[in-house]
């Protein structure tokens, strides 16, 4: 699904990092891990040290303050989770620093973070009907729902 064209004039300004070094586990209790330099995948781990640790940065929209928009970075790196298209793996994009302002096509770096109880959802700002998701025998990708798993638990203070 193509990004919504009206998003191009919405500007997102970086606020601050709101979470450091957390792990994302899906509903099957699989942790997100590095598949290779570019992609992520999910696996059941005995040792959580192998799981990817993420930082979460918050952005404010010029359009509306009430919605929580975030960027996901692999801790202690300059790699950022970047959305592609539906059923395509999310990419790890290297950037020298966290973007101070994001607009237009760069919104593929941003996600709406929604919590409900222990469930966390990350909807792509560029593709508002698609979530960060895990899929059996596949990379972490963007998906609209089942059979992909779109809800995650955040595990904090693992360091």
């Amino acid at each position: 699904s193509a990004p919504f064209s009206f998003l191009s004039n919405v500007k997102y300004n970086f606020m601050r990092i709101i979470k450091y070094e957390f792990i994302l586990n899906d509903a099957l209790n699989q942790s997100i891990i590095r598949a290779n330099d570019q992609y992520l995948t999910a696996a059941a781990l005995h040792n959580l040290d192998e799981a990817v640790k993420f930082d979460m940065g918050a952005y404010k929209s010029s359009k509306d303050d009430a919605k929580i928009t975030v960027i996901l970075r692999i801790s202690k790196t300059q790699l950022y989770v970047t959305a592609q298209d539906e059923d395509q793996p999310v990419l790890l994009k290297e950037m020298p620093e966290i973007p101070k302002t994001i607009t237009g096509s760069e919104t593929n770096l941003l996600f709406f973070w929604e919590t409900h109880g222990t469930k966390n959802y990350f909807t792509s700002v560029a593709h508002p009907n698609l979530f960060i998701a895990t899929k059996q025998d596949y990379w972490v990708c963007l998906a609209g729902g089942p059979p992909s798993i779109t809800d995650f638990q955040i595990l904090e203070n693992q360091a």
Epitope: F4, L7, A66, I68, E114, H116, G117
Partner: antibody, heavy 118, light 113 residues
């Protein structure tokens, strides 16, 4: 699952303040918004204000802007709502709620009756 | 402020029949950037904590019987109980969480006819 336990009923004089606590057991407020809502006798629900602790941002209904203070302790397990310059019409049951980072209530406290009377 | 108006104020429905409660917002609660309606429905019974039934206008909360459903978009929303049970007697509230202040409807009292 988070359970919210609020402090007990209070009787206050007009002009005084009340501070109601809301303790989360089985979890913390870290990833959630906390909303405070009241219900006057025989009336509906009125949103007073709220806080998203991870942003350290509070939000208040205009009518309560100058009288309402909402805070969360450092452990992110107890939220507080303080209402000052109380008047008889502030007599109500005060509720806290949380469970999402949007301002709706998945988990609700049992309510705290605040009576303002001379 | 967004004003939430429920109708009717009270409703009497026979057991097993369908109950429909409407909620109208004075402005849209649909956030175009993520295509979601920021609307929730609650059930309030005397002496019990409030119970979230529906969020995002149509997502049923876990554990809520499937006879409860939410629908609508923009400014017009509906809570439907497909087959009324005795335990559904309560007051029902809609709430918008789109913009501050996050307002509630005045409530609809549901009784058995």
């Amino acid at each position: 699952q988070v359970q919210l336990v609020q402090s007990g009923a209070e009787v206050k004089k007009p002009g005084s303040s009340v501070k109601v606590s809301c303790k989360a057991s089985g979890g913390r407020f870290t990833n959630y918004a906390i909303l405070w809502v009241r219900q006057a006798p025989g009336q509906g629900l009125q949103w007073l204000g709220g806080i998203i602790p991870i942003f350290d941002e509070t939000d208040h209904a205009q009518d309560f802007q100058d009288r309402l203070t909402i805070t969360v302790d450092e452990s992110m397990t107890t939220a507080y709502m303080e209402l000052s310059s109380l008047r008889p019409e502030d007599t109500a049951i005060y509720y806290c709620a949380t469970g999402s980072n949007s301002y709706y209530g998945l988990y609700w406290g049992q309510g705290t009756l605040v009576t303002v009377s001379s | 402020d967004i004003v939430m108006t429920q109708s009717p104020d009270s409703l009497a429905v026979s057991l097993g029949e369908r109950a429909t409660i409407n909620c109208k917002s004075s402005q849209s609660v649909l956030y175009s950037s993520n295509n979601k309606n920021y609307l929730a429905w609650y059930q309030q019974k005397p002496g019990q904590p409030h119970k979230l039934l529906i969020y995002w206008a149509s997502t049923r909360e876990s554990g809520v019987p499937d006879r409860f459903s939410g629908s609508g978009s923009g400014t017009d929303f509906t809570l439907t109980i497909s087959s009324l049970q005795a335990e559904d007697v309560a007051v029902y509230y809609c709430q918008q969480y789109y913009s501050s202040p996050y307002t509630f409807g005045q409530g609809t009292k549901l009784e058995i006819k």
